[in-house]
C-alpha cells in the first residue's frame, strides 16, 4: 500500500476490476465448487458444533468397592502343609490410593515372622557363592534384601549364599500363586461417583442422578448410565480374562467421557463409559510384568519387633475423566464463517488454472494440432487475453521495432554491442488491434482532406517500385531514404534502423505518413488538445511539433501505449520529421528510455 501523502489519501478505496466470462462450462464448475463447499461448511458447522465455545471438563471422582472373597491359603507349619480358609473384605483387599485411582488385591505372597538379624540370602545367580571371596562386606546389591557381611554361609544342604544383615528369613524369590488367591474378586463391584463442572459456562452436574436405581449394574447397551461396575465385566469389555490378569496384576483404565451440549434447545450432558487396558500385557518376564508392591504388617513378639511381609499383586483402576462442554457463541460462529470464506475462492483458483493451462504455448503447439476433441479448448486463449495483460519489465535495453513489410512487431530486449538494430532478430510480438475510436479525436481536416491533384481518391498504397538507393544511404537501409546517425559511436547502432526488413518503398512516401505525422495542422491540433492555451515561439513550437510527430508515428505503428514508449523510429522517418520540424542549432539527442 502506498504511503499516505495527504488526508484525502486516507479516505479512498481500491477494488479489483474483474473479467466476467459467460461460459456454461465454467459457470457449472463454479457452482459445483460453491455447492460442495457450502454443503461441507454447513455440515461441519452442525456436526462438530463449531458455533459453540467449548470448555474442558473439571472433575472430581470418588469410588467405593464392595465384595467378599474366600481365600484358601496353603501354609507350611512345622514342615507340614496346611490349607487355611480366610475371608477377605473391602478393608483387606483395597488400599488407599491418591488421585483418581483405586486398587483391588487379587493375589499375594507372604513371608511371615521376619525380624532383623543375620542370615543367608535366598539362593539366586547373584547370591550363590563358593567361598568368602564371592561376598563383600558392606556390599548392597540393588536386587539384594540386605547388607553383605562378607561371609559365604550354608543356606540349605550344599547350597551356600552370601550372609546378609536384613529382615530374616529372606523373602523367597517365587512365582505368584496360580490360580490367583482372590480369583473371586471378579465379582466385586465398584461405585464411581463423578462430579463435573464447566466454570466458564457456570454449569455443574454429576453422573449419579437423583432417580437412579442403586441396585443396577453397568451394561454397555442395556444399562449404559449405571455407575456400578462389576470388575469381571470391565475386563470382558477390553477382551481380557480377569483370572489371567489377577495372577500378576495389571492396570485398567475406566474412561468417563462427557460431551456436553449446553444450549437450551439441544441440552444434553450425560457421561459415556469405556475401558482400556493400560499396562503392557506382552512384557518380558525380566521386565517385571503385571502390577505389584510390598507392604508389611508390624507386630511385637517377646519384645522383639517382627513383621509379616506381603507381596501384593492386584489391579489398579485409573479413572480418566475428560470431555468438553459447548455453548452457542456468536464470536465462534463469526470466526468459523470467516475462516471458511476463503474456500469459496477455490473455484476461481481452479478455473484460472484451467484457463492458464489450456492457453499455454504447450497446448497450442503440441496438443491442439493433433487432438480434435481438444479443439473447443482453444477458446481459453481468448479468455486468457481478456483476463491477463502481459507487461515486459522496462529494462534499459528494452526496444520495440516495427517494419512496414511485417505484420508483427519485434521486441529487442538485449544490448546491441555494436550491431545495427536493423540486424538484430528480436522476439516476435503480435501487433495490438487498432482502436478506431482514437481516430475520432483527430481533426476533421484529416477525415475529409481535399484530394491531391493528380492522384486518385482510392486508398493510397505504398508505391510498388523500390526507391533507388541513394549513394549516401547506409548498408543497413532497405528503403533508400535513411541517413547515417549523428550520435557518438557507442550509441549509433540504436538509430541504424530502416522502416523495412527487405528492400522496397519507404513508409515516408505514404500519404498517411504525411497526413498523420507531418501535418502541421494535425500536430498543432493535438498539442492544443492537450494544452488549449498553448502559445509558443517558433523554435520551441518546432521542438514540440517534432516530438509530437515522433509520438504520432509510434502510436500509429505500434498501437499499444506501452510499446510506443519503447518504440525506436526508423532512421528515414526520424530524418523526415526532423526535416519538417528542424532544430535551429545543436545536435538531436536521439532515443532515451522513459524509465
Amino acid at each position: 500500500m502506498p504511503a499516505c501523502c495527504s488526508c484525502s489519501d486516507v479516505f479512498q478505496y481500491e477494488t479489483n476490476k474483474v473479467t466476467r466470462i459467460q461460459s456454461m462450462n465454467y459457470g457449472t464448475i463454479k457452482w459445483f465448487f460453491h455447492v460442495i463447499i457450502f454443503s461441507y461448511v454447513c455440515f461441519a458447522l452442525v456436526s462438530d458444533k463449531l458455533y459453540q465455545r467449548k470448555e474442558p471438563v473439571i472433575s472430581s471422582v470418588h469410588t467405593k468397592v464392595k465384595g467378599i472373597a474366600e481365600v484358601k491359603e496353603e501354609i507350611v507349619e512345622n514342615g507340614v502343609k496346611k490349607l487355611v480358609h480366610s475371608v477377605f473384605d473391602t478393608a483387606d483387599y483395597t488400599f488407599p490410593l491418591q488421585g483418581n485411582s483405586f486398587f483391588v488385591m487379587t493375589n499375594f505372597l507372604k513371608t511371615e515372622g521376619q525380624e532383623q538379624r543375620l542370615c543367608p540370602e535366598y539362593p539366586t545367580r547373584r547370591t550363590l557363592c563358593s567361598s568368602d571371596r564371592g561376598c563383600k562386606k558392606g556390599w548392597m546389591d540393588p536386587q539384594s534384601k540386605g547388607i553383605q557381611t562378607g561371609r559365604c554361609v550354608v543356606y540349605e544342604g550344599n547350597q551356600k549364599t552370601c550372609e546378609v544383615s536384613a529382615w530374616c528369613p529372606i523373602e523367597a524369590v517365587e512365582e505368584a500363586p496360580r490360580p490367583a488367591l482372590l480369583n473371586s474378586a471378579e465379582n466385586f463391584t465398584v461405585l464411581i461417583k463423578n462430579n463435573i463442572d464447566f466454570p466458564g459456562h457456570n454449569y455443574t452436574t454429576r453422573n449419579i442422578l437423583p432417580g437412579l436405581n442403586i441396585t443396577c449394574t453397568f451394561h454397555k447397551t442395556q444399562n449404559p448410565q449405571c455407575p456400578i461396575f462389576r470388575l469381571g465385566d470391565i475386563f470382558r469389555e477390553t477382551g481380557d480374562n480377569f483370572s489371567d490378569v489377577a495372577i500378576q496384576g495389571g492396570i485398567m483404565g475406566i474412561e468417563i467421557y462427557w460431551d456436553c451440549n449446553l444450549d437450551r434447545w439441544f441440552h444434553h450432558c450425560r457421561p459415556k463409559y469405556s475401558f482400556r487396558r493400560l499396562d503392557d500385557k506382552t512384557t518380558n518376564v525380566s521386565l517385571y510384568p503385571g502390577y505389584n508392591f510390598r507392604y508389611a504388617k508390624y507386630y511385637k513378639e517377646n519384645n522383639v519387633e517382627k513383621r509379616t511381609l506381603i507381596k501384593v499383586f492386584g489391579i489398579r483402576f485409573d479413572i480418566l475423566v475428560f470431555g468438553t462442554g459447548g455453548k452457542f457463541d456468536i464470536i465462534q460462529l463469526v470466526v468459523y464463517i470467516g475462516s471458511t470464506l476463503s474456500y469459496f475462492g477455490l473455484a476461481a483458483v481452479f478455473i484460472d488454472f484451467l484457463i492458464d493451462t489450456y492457453s499455454s504455448n504447450c497446448c497450442r503447439s503440441h496438443i491442439y494440432p493433433w487432438c480434435k476433441c481438444c479443439q473447443p479448448c482453444v477458446v481459453n486463449e481468448y479468455y486468457y487475453r481478456k483476463k491477463c495483460e502481459s507487461i515486459v519489465e522496462p529494462k534499459p535495453t528494452l526496444k520495440y521495432v516495427s517494419f512496414v513489410d511485417e505484420s508483427h512487431i519485434r521486441m529487442v530486449n538485449q544490448q546491441l554491442l555494436g550491431r545495427s538494430l536493423q540486424d538484430v532478430k528480436g522476439q516476435e510480438v503480435p501487433r495490438p488491434a487498432m482502436d478506431f475510436t482514437d481516430l475520432s479525436r483527430l481533426p476533421l481536416a484529416l477525415h475529409d482532406t481535399p484530394p491531391i491533384p493528380g492522384q486518385p481518391e482510392e486508398i493510397q498504397l505504398l508505391r510498388k517500385e523500390a526507391t533507388p538507393r541513394s549513394r549516401d544511404s547506409p548498408v543497413w537501409c532497405q528503403c533508400g531514404s535513411c541517413l547515417p546517425s549523428q550520435l557518438p559511436e557507442s550509441h549509433r547502432c540504436l538509430e541504424e534502423l530502416c522502416c523495412r526488413k527487405k528492400p522496397g518503398a519507404c513508409i515516408t512516401t505514404s500519404e498517411l505518413f504525411r497526413k498523420l505525422v507531418l501535418s502541421r495542422h494535425v500536430l498543432q491540433f493535438l498539442l492544443l488538445y492537450q494544452e488549449p492555451l498553448l502559445a509558443l515561439d517558433v523554435d520551441s513550437t518546432n521542438s514540440r511539433l517534432r516530438h509530437c510527430a515522433y509520438r504520432c508515428y509510434a502510436t500509429w505503428r505500434f498501437g499499444s501505449q506501452d510499446m510506443a514508449d519503447f518504440a525506436i523510429l526508423p532512421s528515414c522517418c526520424r530524418w523526415r520529421i526532423r526535416k519538417e520540424f528542424p532544430k535551429s542549432e545543436g545536435q538531436y539527442s536521439g532515443f532515451k528510455s522513459p524509465y
Partner: nanobody
Framework: EVQLVESGGGVVQPGGSLRLSCAAS????????MGWFRQAPGKEREFVAA???????DYGDSVKGRFTISRDDAKNTVPLQMNSLKPEDTALYYC???????????????????????WGQGTLVTVSS
C-alpha cells in the same frame, strides 16, 4: 540366547604357550561378561579368568601373571592367551557368559561360576613333555 564355541586346545610342552578362543553368537555379545573356567579330571570346576562387558578383568590365583584375557566385540570373540604353561594347567577349558543387560556383575563376583548362565562344550589343553 548365546551359543559359545571354544577352540585352540591341544598338546603343549611345559613352559610353552597356547591361545584359546571363545566365539559367541548373538548381537548382544557386548552386554555379556565373559569368563574362562577349567576342570581337571576328578576335581571341581575352577575359575581361570574373566572380563566384564565394560572391560574390567579378574584372574584366578594360580594363573595370575601368566594368562591374559581380552575381548573383541567386533568379532564376538574372547581370546585367552596362556604363557609359561605348567603340567597342572592340564584340564578341560570352558568358556562362560553372564548377562549384564539388567545390571553389571560386580568385580568381586566375576570368579563365581553361579553368575554365568551360558556355557560352552569345552576344549582340552594338555601340558606334557
Amino acid at each position: 540366547e548365546v551359543q559359545l564355541v571354544e577352540s585352540g586346545g591341544g598338546v603343549v610342552q611345559p613352559g610353552g604357550s597356547l591361545r584359546l578362543s571363545c566365539a559367541a553368537s548373538g548381537r548382544t555379545f557386548r552386554h555379556y561378561a565373559m569368563g574362562w573356567f577349567r576342570q581337571a579330571p576328578g576335581k571341581e570346576r575352577e575359575f581361570v579368568a574373566a572380563i566384564s562387558s565394560y572391560g574390567s578383568t579378574d584372574y584366578g590365583d594360580s594363573v595370575k601373571g601368566r594368562f591374559t584375557i581380552s575381548r573383541d566385540d567386533a568379532k564376538n570373540t574372547v581370546p585367552l592367551q596362556m604363557n609359561s604353561l605348567k603340567p597342572e594347567d592340564t584340564a578341560l577349558y570352558y568358556c562362560a557368559a553372564a548377562d549384564e543387560t539388567l545390571g553389571a556383575v560386580p568385580n568381586f563376583r566375576l570368579h563365581e561360576k553361579y553368575e554365568y548362565e551360558y556355557w560352552g562344550q569345552g576344549t582340552l589343553v594338555t601340558v606334557s613333555s
